[in-house]
Each structure stands twice: as structure tokens, then as C-alpha cells.
């Protein structure tokens, strides 16, 4: 598989936003790349979000996606929003070179994202 690198650990902000870079070593000159973020928890793997982009163009997730991102060469900067403590888990970056053939696939080792829910503000008298 292709080599895919991502940070081991990221701490989400108090607003439930986590960002990390997913970098892949492309064997050649792909023009169409698909990036998928997967969440692994208790051996269950679920898709968080996915985007296909043309090299040199912006990364576009669906409008209702909790992910946003930008791309630069073989690097993708991913941001996941709306995270809560229960979303703490291992987030895996999957990269596929879709075009031109051949197809290449790479899976990162995962980024452990820790999310801490903010303490509610105390009522002021």
C-alpha cells in the first residue's frame, strides 16, 4: 500500500474542532485523489467523511459534512467539527489515487483525537 502519514495524537479545541495533516507518498502523478476519514472504535470502522478532488483544485466535502479541508501537493489538511467527548477515538486517513490508472491505496495508522466537553458556565447571581 501507499505510505500515508498522519499525527499520532490531536486534542480537539474547546469548541469541538480538531485539525490534522494527512500526507501521502504518491508513486506517480495522480490527477484525481479520494480522501476518506474513518473512525475506529471498539474494532468497528465507520466513515466520517470523504472527498474526491482533482490535483491543483480545492478539496470539497458534501455540504452537510462535518469535515472541511484543503490540499497542497501530496498533503491534505483536514478539519473535523462538531466533536463531543463521545467522539473521542482513532481517526484514520485513507487515500486513493483514482485516476489515471493504476489504482493505489494507502491507509494511515490513525490519529487519536481526544475531545473534552467544556464545563458549563456557572450561573451568575
Amino acid at each position: 500500500a501507499m505510505h500515508v502519514a498522519q499525527p499520532a495524537v490531536v486534542l480537539a479545541s474547546s469548541r469541538g474542532i480538531a485539525s490534522f495533516v494527512c500526507e501521502y507518498a504518491s508513486p506517480g502523478k495522480a490527477t484525481e485523489v479520494r480522501v476518506t476519514v474513518l473512525r475506529q472504535a471498539d474494532s468497528q470502522v465507520t466513515e466520517v467523511c470523504a472527498a474526491t478532488y482533482m490535483m491543483g483544485n480545492e478539496l470539497t466535502f458534501l455540504d452537510d459534512s462535518i469535515c472541511t479541508g484543503t490540499s497542497s501537493g501530496n498533503q491534505v489538511n483536514l478539519t473535523i467539527q462538531g466533536l463531543r467527548a463521545m467522539d473521542t477515538g482513532l481517526y484514520i486517513c485513507k487515500v486513493e489515487l483514482m485516476y489515471p490508472p493504476p489504482y493505489y491505496l494507502g491507509i494511515g495508522n490513525g490519529t487519536q483525537i481526544y475531545v473534552i466537553d467544556p464545563e458549563p458556565c456557572p450561573d451568575s447571581d
Partner: antibody, heavy 115, light 107 residues
Amino acid sequence: EVQLVESGGGLVQPGGSIRLSCAASGFTFSDNWMNWVRQAPGKGLEWLAQIRNKPYNYETYYSASVKGRFTISRDDSKNSVYLQMNSLKTEDTGVYYCTAQFAYWGQGTLVTVSS
Amino acid sequence: DIQMTQSPSSLSASVGDRVTITCRTSENIYGGLNWYQRKPGKSPKLLIYGATNLASGVSSRFSGSGSGTDYTLTISSLQPEDVATYYCQNVLSSRPGFGSGTKLEIK
């Protein structure tokens, strides 16, 4: 048009050696990982070896059945990949295909190992 | 190495039938699965890559599905020219092994 043309097959005695070649054209050879796959008579497809390209430091991988006996190599200046096959056994008989990361395939070359 | 279990080993169906072939892997391969068609005396032909993507020039009768460890190749309406042996292959591993094959015949 993409083309992969294997050559070098033939009859070889058990314990002998043979070298297969695969000449590629119609795509950017140096951008791709190259593989050898075989099909023995009455058997299924068997992946044998892979050589990656320059960004991957030409890493090589082998199936357990050929490791230590077969060597894959490539010459990007000649758009060619090779399979050096040593210590051949009768069970190595089959049609050998080269493939550019399984998207493009050659027509195959027959290797027969027999005394 | 990742083990590939393909079933059935052979299959006989009628023209127009919907045909499914399955492939199970010994561990999660994250959709890194290809399907091939091989006709006697011909080179293997890539049908589906990345579990669900139709290769260029392949009839839309063919489709792939699945994730994790379970994958399926479906032929929506079997045609006489589909007689062949079909193989799955794990492309995630550095040792990209094939399934044992499914020989498809027409009744």
C-alpha cells in the same frame, strides 16, 4: 496504447534458471509499481513479486513460494521489468504475466519446468 | 499474510440471471479489493478497483460492493460472454494475494 510484452519463457530443467523480461510502452513506466503474477496449469492466479518505483526506493516484495529463489528488478531507462528465476521446480510451470499494478497486463509467457 | 476466501468455487447460471460472487478477507482491508475476469487463453482483465469502482471499458452489468472484510461482485444480467473465471484480490497488503477463483458457466 498501453502495451506490456513478456519474453524469455521456455523449457527449463528442474534446478535450472531462466530470466523473464517485460517491455512496457504507452504509459509512464517510472510512475508505477510493477508485478509478476503466474497461473499454473489448472490453478488460479498467484501473485509472485512486486517492485516499487523511485519514490519508494525500488522496494521489492515476494510471495512465500518464490522468496529466495526469484528476483524482480527494473530498468526505468528501458521501460522494462525482469524476473530472474533460480532453483526452478516442476511446480513453477505456468504462464507468467507482468502487470503495472494490476491495471495493465501483458499477454503472458509460458515457462515449463521439466526434465 | 491476509487470507482471501472466495466463494463459490464454481457457479452455473442462466442468461439474464443476477449472479453474485463473494470474497472474505482475514482482516479489514479498508476497501482495498479488486475483481478480475479471466477467460481461457486471455490475460486477466481488471473489472472493479477499490471494491466499488468500475474499471474503464467494463460493462455496467458488473458492480462491486462491500467494506471491511466482506466484498461482493455482482453481474446484474448474465450474458454468454461473461463465461470466465473471476478472482478477487487484496491490494492493501504489500503481498497482494488473490482469491482462489470462481468459475462461472452458463446453464
